[in-house]
Every structure is written in C-alpha cells, then in structure tokens.
Amino acid sequence: EVEKTACPSGKKAREIDESLIFYKKWELEACVDAALLATQMDRVNAIPFTYEQLDVLKHKLDELYPQGYPESVIQHLGYLFLKMSPEDIRKWNVTSLETLKALLEVNKGHEMSPQVATLIDRFVKGRGQLDKDTLDTLTAFYPGYLCSLSPEELSSVPPSSIWAVRPQDLDTCDPRQLDVLYPKARLAFQNMNGSEYFVKIQSFLGGAPTEDLKALSQQNVSMDLATFMKLRTDAVLPLTVAEVQKLLGPHVEGLKAEERHRPVRDWILRQRQDDLDTLGLGLQGGIPNGYLVLDLSMQEALS
C-alpha cells in the first residue's frame, strides 16, 4: 500500500462547504473525513464539484461502506448518484419513496440509465409490488416505464395502481403487456359509467378479448381508427360488420384507408362481401356471395 499524502496544515475539512471545490484530488483524499462526508451528504449537491472531485468523494464513501450505503446517505447523494454503477446500487436497500424521488430527480430529463433501472428494480423488489404511489412516481419521471416491464413483472401491479396510468405511458407497450394490463384496468374502472369508462379503458384495449369488444359496440363509443388498429387481430376477426360499424360509429369510414393493414385486412377476409358492401366504403376482399364458411376451429374443438 502506497503511503498516502498527508493533509497540509490548516486544510483539514471541518465541514462540507464551497471551499472544497478548490481542493485538489489529493487534498480531498487526505483532508476530507469519510464520516463527515456521510453526515453532510445533503451539502454536496449544493457545491458545484467537478466529475473528478465527485469521483474522489465516491471512493471515500465506498471505503466507509463497503457493503453498500445506508439509506440516510443514499437519499442525499444528489449528483453523486450519477457516479454510481449498477453494481454499487445492487448493494443498496432503498425503501423510502422519498429516496427514490430524490434520485430520479437527479436524472430528470435524461433517458433511463442502467443505474436508474437497477435502482427501480431494487426498490420495487423491496416493496413486493408496484403500488400506486410508486407507479405514479415512476411514470411521472419515465412515461415509458410500464412498457419496459415484462408481463411477469406487470402481473404484480395491483388494479388500484392502474388509475395512475396515462395514455402516453402505454405508447410502447406490446400486445403481451396489454394482455396483462387490460384485465386490471377493466377491474379498476368497472364502476364507471359508459362514456367515462371508455375514455379510461381505451388505451388498454390492445389487450381486450372479442366479447368485450362486442359489449363496447353496444355502447355508442365511437372508437377512433388509431385505437382500432391496435386491437388484437384474434379479437377483431369474429366481429360482424354490424358490430364493427357500431364500434367505430362515424369513424367507420377510416377502414378504407386501412384496408391493407392488420387487423382490418384480416377482418375483411373473414366477412361476406355483401355485408362489407352495406358499409358503402368500397372494401374488397370479402367472401364472395354463395360461398359456405366452415369454422374449422370449432369442428376441432368438438372432435
């Protein structure tokens, strides 16, 4: 072990203050006591240390807490959080939502870094489930957070937390994720009346089964084409022309522009051409009149 340079006379830090920004690397190492730093972490953020000076301070904390920092220190890390590696963060036990908020604030405006992802993972695992307050906090900082979770992770989201979800939070979700979220949303919003219910449930409909879409078609909801295009193909296929017409209301005219895209293309192929003609949109590709349609899947189920 190389002998450390001694702190020059009169330079020993009595408190964490602005004067330390003029301390050289070796002076910070020699003159700032790690225990003092830990108790005055809240002051570090107010001092415009450079990244190299923050590196020195981090080394000090690492030596003081080799098993991981206590939450009292973590909560006040501020900019020093940007120095932490995912390996550092895995040693932490973060239980307070205030701590989580304080650290997310430091990273605000940036993409979710591996450090932040690790922090959130540690926090959620510590809580056992993704409760409403946590979800509120996470989606406020990272609108795409929900869609970054696996279907398995989403299964721990209680229905009550769904109230915190905004439409933009689901923009990048795939069908597997919406399959998990939709039943929770349906449960969460079940006591709302028709039009209010539809406004809330709309963003989750990419996970809705056929029977729910049929029920919605009876409620004059006027679903827009963007929502319709995100529906599960297997849920749309069994819908009749009349049901789709009721579901879309005045937006039904938009089907023409989407006739080559799923799920509209596949749905058209399953409809009788004369039924499609009743829409007056010029949709082509339906089953010609006089053809018999056998539902083989039904036959298989019976045999």
Epitope: K25, W26, P48, T50, Q53
Partner: antibody
Framework: EVQLQQSGADLVKPGASVKLSCIVS????????MHWVKQRPEQGLEWIGS????????KYDPKFQVKATITADTSSNTAYLQLSSLTSEDTAVYYC??????????WGQGTTLTVSS | DIVMTQSQKFMSTSVGDRVSITCKAS??????VAWYQQKPGQSPKALIY???NRHTGVPDRFTGSGSGTDFTLTISNVQSEDLADYFC?????????VGGGTKLEIK
C-alpha cells in the same frame, strides 16, 4: 516545475498499433488524473479519456472506447495511450494533460502520429 | 452527452480592444468549465478554471464568467500575443467535451 514529457513523433502503417508515453516529473501521478486529448490538423480538441492512477480506473469517450487504452505506471510516473487498428483518421497530435480534479493545469508538448503506408 | 458550442468560429479585433468569446453547454454544467488558449504550433494552456478563476500566471486582462449553460471568456485590452485559438471545456461529467474553438485574429 511540473513537466509532462511526451514520446517523439511516430510514423506507423495502417492496421498497426502504437503506444504513446507521457513521463511526469515534479509530482506523483497517483495524486492526480491523467488525460489524453486528440487534435487533428486544423481541427479542434477531442477528449479521448483519462485515468485515475491511484485506483487504476480509466474512463473513455465512447467514441474511443475500442480504439484507445489508457494505462499508468506509478513506479515510473508515466501515463500511456495505446491506439490500435490504426487508420488515416488517427493521424493527429496527441496531448497528455494533468488534472488535479477541476481542469487541465499542465499539458505535454504533444506527440505527432502519422498513419501512412 | 454534453455538447459545448462556441458559435463564433473566428473573431477579429484590434490591439487595445475588448473581446468576449462565448460558449454554450447543452445542459447544466454548473461552474465546471475551463478555458484554454492554444497559440499556433504550441500546446494548449489553461487560462480559466471553474468558470471564473484565473490559472496561475495568467494576466488579469483575461476574465471568465457564467454558470449553468452560458459561459464567457473576456479579454480586455487585447494584445498582439493573444492571437490564438480559444477553447472551452466542460469538466462536469463524462465524457468531457470541448467547444469547437474560436480563432482570435488581430487586425
């Protein structure tokens, strides 16, 4: 007086590797950070990366992560920059610089590297 | 990554004049900015550190100001030996980044 003495100019062939050195006098490199900076003819400065010799911890600009390796030998008080798979794009003057934690207070005289067949 | 922008590539001034060179950071870098001077054929030299502190031996006609995202290097009473390139550099976070430089020409 602090001095950073860099190795002499080098002419190397494309595809080869080169190791530039920066010998430091009048201070202990473990008490500082050592940086490397690239400057191509008539162009600005580009930070390549740095090393904390006391903790043997190097950091790089992602752009140079594959190209450059920064090391330090505390016994000889020397910092090194190794550049691999050289191309004409690597033709430049390379500077080492010392930082006490907040700016580059001393610079080497620069090493001119020419990559040509 | 933080981008440092020096919008003036060239500036022309006369001996005795006062000139201000600006540098803008793409995000808040607090006061962790340094200014460097590079004369033709020489290595860069430090002028200002932590936005407003003069490096040892730098004449007091060089002053630095600013914090956050906007920084200025001011040279009052410009001398002929000030003909050089001037660079700002942020020391706030990795990777360090340097402004494109401003070449000061003396009329």
């Amino acid at each position: 007086e602090v001095q950073l003495q860099q190795s002499g100019a080098d002419l190397v062939k494309p595809g080869a590797s080169v190791k530039l050195s920066c010998i430091v006098s009048a201070f202990n490199i473990e008490d500082t950070y050592m940086h490397w900076v690239k400057q191509r003819p008539e162009q600005g400065l580009e930070w390549i990366g740095s090393i904390d010799p006391a903790h043997d911890n190097a950091k790089y600009d992602p752009k140079f992560q594959v190209k450059a390796t920064i090391t330090a030998d505390t016994s000889s008080n020397t910092a090194y920059l190794q550049l691999s798979s050289l191309t004409s794009e690597d033709t430049a003057v390379y500077y080492c610089a010392k930082s006490d934690g907040f700016y580059f207070d001393s610079w080497g005289q620069g090493t001119t590297l020419t990559v040509s067949s | 990554d933080i981008v440092m922008t020096q919008s003036q590539k060239f500036m022309s001034t006369s001996v005795g004049d006062r000139v201000s060179i600006t540098c803008k950071a793409s995000q808040n870098v607090r006061s962790a900015v340094a200014w460097y001077q590079q004369k033709p054929g020489q290595s860069p030299k430090a002028l200002i550190y932590l936005a407003s502190n003069r490096h040892t031996g730098v004449p007091d006609r060089f002053t630095g100001s600013g914090s956050g995202t906007d920084f200025t290097l001011t040279i009052s009473n410009v001398q002929s030996e000030d003909l050089a390139d001037y660079f700002c550099l942020q020391h706030w976070n990795y990777p360090l980044s340097v402004g494109g430089g401003t070449k000061l020409e003396i009329k």
